[in-house]
Amino acid sequence: EEELQVIQPDKSVSVAAGESAILHCTVTSLIPVGPIQWFRGAGPARELIYNQKEGHFPRVTTVSESTKRENMDFSISISNITPADAGTYYCVKFRKGSPDTEFKSGAGTELSVRAKPS
């Protein structure tokens, strides 16, 4: 059978300051069991952008409905973009465990921020 893939279709996204950025991510399977998280950057210093379970992420909303069954769309929207938000964003599938372990990452989407139109 096919192993789960994490698909980030956009290599790059450009957004004007003050607008919202949509970062697309889909997975190809419901299993293995475990959560999806979003990060900016890679490696041990990466910054957690969204985790459904813990944390407070007031600028992040999920694109799919909160009651959607068998959801495989893990796209997010980040509001009120500023130049400080520029970077590469990764959608990462974790395998459930104690603790959860990283299973597969998307290829990343580079977010660039344009100056606010005057």
Partner: antibody, heavy 120, light 108 residues
Framework: DVQLLESGGGVVQPGGSLRLSCAAS????????MTWVRQAPGEGLEWVST??????YYADSVKGRFTISRDNSKNTLYLQMNSLRAEDTAVYYC???????????????WGLGTLVTVSS | EIVLTQSPATLSVSPGERATLSCRAS??????LAWYQQKPGQAPRLLIY???IRETGIPARFSGSGSGTEFTLTISSLQSEDFAVYYC??????????FGGGTKVEIK
């Protein structure tokens, strides 16, 4: 129509072994996690084990004694039960996992169950 | 492990009356809670998921509410086929998945 049919239950002595099967139809079996839940006579529901693809999860009460597995080519879920104890006596249900949005799993279809009795 | 406590253990209700069943979680489970109905000799049946969403085919007289640690299943007007045992289940933090001890709804 989703159907789950358990088999393999019966009477076994303490310390013995039994292998339960659950034949699934009516959905893409390989795409879903599957779960075993048991119910002792006159008692409530107790989660036993869940399997995703290669990932398996067990209740502490059965860890090291029970093994969950699946054969996607046969659309079948298994539960190998070793070192059985009197307290394992229960109806064993297999259930299909479902998810909502970014959350965990609940169970949207259940089989009719198979009774396992551990007694000398 | 998250403990779910259901109350009352038994609820005696007349047909046509409203039944209110409670499920309390030992810690916050957000909306990650399901309700099941089980009749004697039968498998459980999913009624409600995500605390308030009715499963396809479940009559509108069943409704779920609550979030965090306090949840309610309401049956607005009990029909004869509704007399059964009802279980809540949390799927916020697992393993283990945990179920409440059940509430038996019996005919008054």
């Amino acid at each position: 129509d989703v159907q789950l049919l358990e088999s393999g239950g019966g009477v076994v002595q303490p310390g013995g072994s039994l292998r339960l099967s659950c034949a699934a139809s009516g959905f893409s079996f390989s795409n879903f996690a599957m779960t075993w839940v048991r119910q002792a006579p006159g008692e409530g529901l107790e989660w036993v084990s869940t399997i995703g693809s290669g990932d398996t999860y067990y209740a502490d009460s059965v860890k090291g004694r029970f093994t969950i597995s699946r054969d996607n080519s046969k659309n079948t879920l298994y539960l190998q039960m070793n070192s059985l104890r009197a307290e394992d006596t229960a109806v064993y249900y297999c259930a299909k996992d479902s998810t909502v949005s970014w959350s965990g799993d609940f169970f949207d279809y259940w089989g009719l169950g198979t009774l396992v009795t551990v007694s000398s | 492990e998250i403990v779910l406590t259901q109350s009352p253990a038994t609820l005696s209700v007349s047909p046509g009356e409203r039944a209110t069943l409670s499920c309390r979680a030992s810690q916050n489970v957000k909306n990650d809670l399901a309700w099941y109905q089980q009749k004697p000799g039968q498998a459980p049946r999913l009624l409600i998921y995500a605390a308030r969403i009715r499963e396809t085919g479940i009559p509108a007289r069943f409704s779920g509410s609550g979030s965090g640690t306090e949840f309610t299943l309401t049956i607005s007007s009990l029909q004869s086929e509704d007399f059964a045992v009802y279980y809540c289940q949390q799927y916020y933090d697992w393993p283990p998945f945990t179920f409440g001890g059940g509430t038996k709804v019996e005919i008054k």
